[in-house]
């Protein structure tokens, strides 16, 4: 912690501006007001500080409001940002864009996905839901940056939107995420014929039930790969060969190359042996031939 | 030895169709799948499509989907591409290739089909 | 369709130097599961049939020389031949097999300088 010191009258700061990167350390913690420095807050990113100097205006900061910084001076935070911790964050209350969006730029190329995750977080809650607007800013700022966000804030996306999210700003959403996505996508592309349905719906396709992967596989959608490897386990077990021909189409001919891999692995090993001969692939490990599979979770269940 | 043997140089007429060969040996038949990819003379190259030779269901790029036809022999391990309804930019060498797994692993010589009236 | 732009459309280089082709896909071609990215390299050398050099980005085929490396991830590829040799002229192309129509670049010729 900096020392307490008192400031020389001729060091006394009544305006932040650049002759402030010349005091030290303890000269910055003794000579500037914190109020002064909340006031003032637009000027600081312009101020080519120190790291160690950020250290001692954040320490001013942190003492000046307890409890969280008001957003008047989260919008001006600039370079400053990179100084916060997520608990720092967690107790702040944000609610507008232009801030978000000016401190998704100050993290641009730094390692915070702790602190963006943490912030957006507080300005779902801010906002009191994920609305459009918010979606629009986080794809255009943060690519994937949706899915940092939790299943519970995720609900909160109404249908409507859905419509802004693109493909890439699902590829980090685990199977949770989409599990709450996937229904309000569902929904939100109804109305729309086979092909563009499945076009849309494919991003969001990790959330599926098996009905619906079922049902995907009678509409020649020809499922790429990556897709089907997104897919819960739970929806691809009970799959049959001929359905998984039909759902992949020309991408079946993958699966040698990812058979090694969850689902696919567990895929095969449930499938009779002839069965999965009939894709051409030198698949192995299937049930052999006159072997009889007995489901003992049903027994179970029962008793 | 992996190996792919294409049938002869072909001319056609505007209008008429080609059956291209390729025959396989040098592995088990049915365990990999072919593909068709053509090259117009000084171009890229162009996938139209490939084949399970098991069970003989093909999938083709839907820029040929009305003209082209895959189909398999598996008595003599041949695959066969037809193209109907030809047309001077069909003129091009005409390729079958073994898949490794997606991408193509093993090429024949190409048949080269040329479209003149 | 996933359109794959390479770059640049020939080079020349002397015997011996790197040579570095860049391929550049319209959308990712990494499978996020299995961490394998679906681009495999062909060098087509001149009146003849096209051959494997690489998969899944980075895998060099058995039997393809080491100066040939892969590398790159999610829409952005480079293909790098280490020191030059005679032998080496020919078209290269990059084609992901990630969906259908699987798609190739438009090639890029290497040339002695």
């Known amino acids: 912690d900096v020392e307490r010191t008192t400031c020389p009258p001729e060091k006394e700061v009544h305006e932040i501006d650049e002759s402030l990167i010349f005091y030290k350390k303890r000269e910055l913690e003794a000579c500037v007001d914190a109020a002064l420095l909340a006031a003032q807050m637009d000027r600081v990113d312009a101020i080519p500080f120190t790291y160690e100097q950020l250290d001692v205006l954040k320490h001013k900061l942190d003492e000046l409001y307890p409890q969280g910084y008001p957003e008047s001076v989260i919008r001006h935070l600039g370079h400053l940002f990179l100084k916060m911790s997520p608990e720092d964050i967690r107790k702040w209350n944000v609610t507008s864009l232009e801030t978000l969006k000016a401190l998704l730029k100050v993290s641009k190329g730094h390692e915070m996905s702790a602190q963006v995750a943490t912030l957006i977080d507080r300005v779902v809650v801010g906002r009191g839901q994920l609305d459009k607007d918010t979606v629009d800013t986080l794809t255009a700022f943060c690519p994937g940056c949706l899915c940092s966000l939790s299943p519970e804030r995720l609900s909160s996306v109404p249908p409507s939107v859905i419509g802004a999210v693109r493909p890439q700003d699902l590829d980090t959403c685990g199977p949770r995420q989409l599990d709450v996505l996937y229904p309000k996508a569902r929904l939100a592309f109804q109305n729309m014929s086979g092909s563009e349905y499945f076009v849309k719906i494919r991003p969001f396709l990790g959330g599926a039930p098996t009905e619906d992967v079922k049902a995907l596989s009678q509409q020649n959608v020809s499922m790429d790969l990556a897709t089907f490897m997104k897919l819960r386990r739970e929806a691809v077990l009970p799959l049959t060969v001929a359905e998984v021909q039909k759902l992949l189409g020309p991408h079946v001919e993958g699966l040698k190359v990812e058979e090694q891999h969850s689902p696919v692995r567990d895929w095969i090993l449930k499938q009779r042996q002839d069965d999965l001969d009939t894709l051409g692939l030198g698949l192995q490990g299937g049930i052999p031939n006159g072997y009889l599979i007995l489901d003992l979770s049903v027994r179970e269940a029962l008793s | 030895e992996v190996q792919l043997v294409q049938s002869g140089a072909e001319v056609k007429k505007p209008g008429a169709s080609v059956k291209v060969s390729c025959k396989a040996s040098?592995?088990?038949?049915?365990?990999?799948?072919m593909h068709w990819v053509r090259q117009a003379p000084g171009q890229g190259l162009e996938w139209m499509g490939n084949?399970?030779?098991?069970?003989?269901?093909?999938y083709y790029n839907e820029r040929f989907m009305s003209r082209v036809t895959m189909t398999v022999d598996k008595s003599t391990s041949t695959v066969y591409m037809e193209l109907s309804s030809l047309r001077s930019e069909d003129t091009a060498v005409y390729y079958c290739?073994?898949?490794?797994?997606?991408?193509?692993?093993?090429w024949g010589q190409g048949t080269l089909v040329t479209v003149s009236s | 369709d996933i359109v794959m732009t390479q770059s640049p459309d020939s080079l020349a280089v002397s015997l011996g130097e790197r040579a570095t082709i860049n391929c550049k896909s319209s959308q990712t071609l990494l499978n996020s599961v299995s961490q394998n990215n679906y681009l495999a390299w062909y060098q087509q050398k001149p009146g003849q049939s096209p051959t494997l050099l690489i998969y899944?980005?980075?895998t060099r085929e058995s039997g393809v020389p080491d100066r040939f490396s892969g590398s790159g991830s999610g829409t952005d590829f480079t293909l790098t031949i280490s020191s030059l040799q005679a032998e080496d002229v020919a078209v290269y192309y990059c084609q992901q097999h990630y969906r259908t129509p699987y798609t190739f670049g438009g090639g890029t010729k290497v040339e002695i300088k």
């Open positions: 040098g592995y088990t038949f049915t365990n990999y799948w």
């Open positions: 899944f980005a980075s």
């Open positions: 290739a073994r898949s490794g797994g997606l991408w193509l692993a093993f």
């Open positions: 084949i399970n030779p098991s069970s003989g269901d093909s």
